[in-house]
């Protein structure tokens, strides 16, 4: 797959592949003079024809050198509870982070976990009673395994396998926005924003001070957390005297729409509360903070707008890469579209298609994006994150192209380099019209379904859709049948 072609090597210009093949280096060697440059993926156009044998050689060389590596062989990230115990999870236990250092690398990946939110006493109590790991650090395991973009295996993470990896567990239930401690008046602390700040402060003493790039990434509520906190992290580092650390964001599955629900429902609990209602209530309950420049655009009491990607994005200073399924399951959940394996009604089907259109529209002016036409939720820490493609480009490849756009030789131009795109939004109109989407299974039999089966299963009427698309039903069926799945995930 595309994503496999990003083994890293030092050097400012993409070199012509020399014999013997260059190796992925665990320790990035300091260049002789001045600042070390950011590690730079190879340009493999010259060996494109014989890629498989080239990669096999590289892999076998890499494996034989692996034992000599400065890295520990242990893949786990290790838990560190915050030394500043006043920065806490909901229940007052100290927040923390999991870290796996990569001594030779000046790249740091800080990942914000997702896990929805709660926005009043009742649903926070319920969350504390059934999902305590998302509100307390008391039972966190001592280690975690890095997966997807947090993996240190080049096969699983062709993008940044050599980076320093940090996983920040979500235990504040506030979409990473809060800054209020537990008190006699407040049963729970909501300190998501402060947790990020404190983790960054503590990491400065563990090598982050020498970083070239800090990528603040997150999925779901963590993805929204990236949008809300990326500029504040950059400001913090500047204030603390580290202005040369480039702060960037990667927001996965956190770009929500404040749209009208398919069926209006009362805001009783997290699942069926409309996006705007939940955030309006939440921001008050959490004493939520939003980016300063966004806050200035909305009058007092309207800060909730800044939780929605398409409204906050234009106000951000840091570059942000947006990853978003066009048919995000969490978006559909809060919009009261519950796909339970039963055929959907025509109204639901049109609503789903319209959601894809609206979402595509909001990404039009987002410079760096990856938006496949799939029904799913979250991707970057899934081990199959390398498999999905948009317009023939995988996500790790798109991230690599985005990385390259920050190099000096390309600074002047904001347009992507030829053959290295990073604005990738599917244009086909319904869920799973992209054949590389994660596999969908029949909820009752467990059987894998191809696109045609999935759409039929949802009550999709070929005749009607062919008419909508202005094409022959037979042509549409042919297109769908070619969309068989080759990936085995979920």
């Amino acid at each position: 797959s595309e994503g496999r072609k990003t083994w890293r090597r030092r050097g400012q210009q993409p070199p012509q592949p020399p014999p013997p093949p260059p190796l992925p280096q665990r320790a990035e060697v300091e260049p002789g003079a001045g600042q070390p440059v950011e590690s730079f993926p190879l340009d493999f156009t010259a060996v494109e024809g014989n890629m498989d044998s080239f990669m096999a050689q590289v892999k076998s060389l890499a494996q034989s050198l692996y034992p000599c590596s400065a890295q520990q062989l242990n893949e786990d990230l290790r838990l560190h509870l915050l030394l500043n115990t006043s920065v806490t999870c909901n229940d007052g236990s100290p927040a923390g982070y999991y870290l796996k250092e990569s001594k030779g690398s000046r790249r740091w990946l800080l990942f914000l976990e997702g896990g929805w939110y709660c926005f009043n006493r009742e649903n926070c109590d319920s969350r504390y009673s059934t999902m305590r790991r998302l509100m307390s650090s008391k039972d966190w395991p001592h280690t975690r395994t890095g997966t997807g973009i947090l993996s240190s295996q080049p096969e699983e993470n062709p993008h940044w396998w050599n980076a320093n990896m940090v996983f920040i567990p979500y235990c504040s239930s506030d979409v990473w926005s809060g800054a209020s401690p537990k008190s006699d008046k407040n049963e729970y602390a909501f300190m998501g924003s402060l947790i990020i700040q404190e983790v960054v402060r503590e990491l400065l003493g563990k090598g982050l001070s020498g970083a070239k790039v800090l990528l603040l990434a997150g999925s779901s509520a963590g993805g929204t957390g990236v949008l809300l906190n990326v500029d504040r992290v950059a400001e913090l580092l500047e204030e603390l005297g580290y202005p040369s650390i480039q702060v960037r964001g990667l927001a996965d599955s956190g770009w929500f729409l404040d749209n009208k629900q398919y069926r209006r429902s009362d805001c009783i609990d997290t699942i069926n509360c409309a996006p705007t209602d939940a955030i309006r209530r939440g921001i008050r309950y959490w004493s939520g903070m939003v980016p300063e420049r966004c806050q200035r655009q909305f009058k007092e009491g309207e800060e909730w707008n800044c939780f929605f990607g398409y409204k906050v994005y234009p106000t951000l200073r840091c570059p942000v890469f947006v990853v978003q399924w066009l048919f995000d399951e969490a978006q559909l959940t809060v919009d009261n579209v519950h796909l339970t394996g039963q055929p959907v009604q025509e109204g639901q089907w049109l609503y789903i298609q319209n959601l894809g259109r609206e979402l595509r529209g909001t990404l039009k002016d987002v410079q760096a994006s990856f938006a496949p036409a799939c029904l799913s939720h979250e991707i970057i820490i899934r081990s199959y994150w390398t498999d999905v493609q948009v317009k023939g480009t995988s996500l790790p490849r798109a991230l690599h192209c985005w990385d390259r756009s920050f190099h000096d030789s390309h600074k002047a131009s904001k347009t992507p380099m030829k053959g290295c795109p990073f604005h990738l939004v599917d244009s086909c109109p319904w869920p799973h019209c992209n054949p590389s989407c994660p596999t969908i299974r029949d909820q009752f039999t467990g059987q894998e379904m191809n696109v045609a089966q999935f759409l039929m299963h949802m009550g999709f009427d070929v005749q009607t859709v062919a008419q909508q698309q202005g094409m022959e039903p037979s042509k549409l069926l042919g297109m769908l049948s070619n969309g068989n799945h080759h990936h085995h995930h979920h």
Partner: antibody
Framework: DVQLVESGGGLVQPGGSRKLSCAAS????????MHWVRQAPEKGLEWVAY????????YYADTVRGRFTISRDTPKNTLFLQMTSLRSEDTAMYYC?????????WGQGTSVTVSS | DIQMTQSPASLYVSVGETVTITCRAS??????LAWYQQKQGKSPQLLVY???NLADGVPSRFSGSGSGTQYSLKINSLKSEDFGSYYC?????????FGSGTKLEIK
């Protein structure tokens, strides 16, 4: 050590009532959600009712809503299930369970038989 | 309400084998899933919570995986004490439905 001990089971006539109790010890009772789960003879587990920590919000399965009432007496560390209008299909072993992440501690169960 | 479809209903296996039990939710439950073991005449015991986290004291031969609607419990090199019934349960909005159970029996 965490302990949950149910009591109050027995034979009840259809249409009759029964109150089950669950005595908790070894943990801070008010800090945990508490559930009732039942299991009919030779059948699987069925979730019945739940009361959250803190505010004590209450939730029921559709099969018992309107007939069963869950409550807790925090000072006495006791959970209750008041069952009314009992039917033969309510015959089961009733377990109380504590929750934080999943139902992490269960009592030994108390058996309720609804029969004439 | 969310339905949990558990399979298989029963499994005949030998000590030392590896087994996988699956649970499918009728909609995304965002990893809010627990697995339990119940031995004949005993109360259930929590094995896994949050889809992948092992409960205290559970041997490492047990592991949970999955996301979205698809979840599984894997038991490596079965021991004689692992035989019994296994249930999944979701915690994504009430009712907190259980799967119908999988009975693990000695071959």
């Amino acid at each position: 050590d965490v302990q949950l001990v149910e009591s109050g089971g027995g034979l009840v006539q259809p249409g009759g009532s029964r109150k089950l109790s669950c005595a908790a010890s070894g943990f801070t009772f008010s800090s945990f959600g508490m559930h009732w789960v039942r299991q009919a003879p030779e059948k699987g587990l069925e979730w019945v009712a739940y009361i959250t920590s803190g505010s004590g919000a209450i939730y029921y399965a559709d099969t018992v809503r309107g007939r069963f009432t869950i409550s807790r007496d925090t000072p006495k560390n006791t959970l209750f299930l008041q069952m009314t209008s009992l039917r033969s299909e309510d015959t089961a072993m009733y377990y109380c369970a504590r929750s934080a992440d999943g139902l992490d501690y269960w009592g030994q169960g108390t058996s309720v038989t609804v029969s004439s | 309400d969310i339905q949990m479809t558990q399979s298989p209903a029963s499994l005949y296996v030998s000590v030392g084998e590896t087994v996988t039990i699956t649970c499918r939710a009728s909609e995304n439950i965002y990893s809010n899933l627990a697995w339990y073991q119940q031995k004949q005449g005993k109360s259930p015991q929590l094995l896994v919570y949050g889809a992948t986290n092992l409960a205290d004291g559970v041997p490492s031969r047990f592991s949970g995986s999955g996301s979205g609607t698809q979840y599984s419990l894997k038991i490596n090199s079965l021991k004689s004490e692992d035989f019994g019934s296994y249930y999944c349960q979701h915690f994504w909005g009430t009712p907190f439905t259980f799967g119908s159970g999988t009975k693990l029996e000695i071959k």
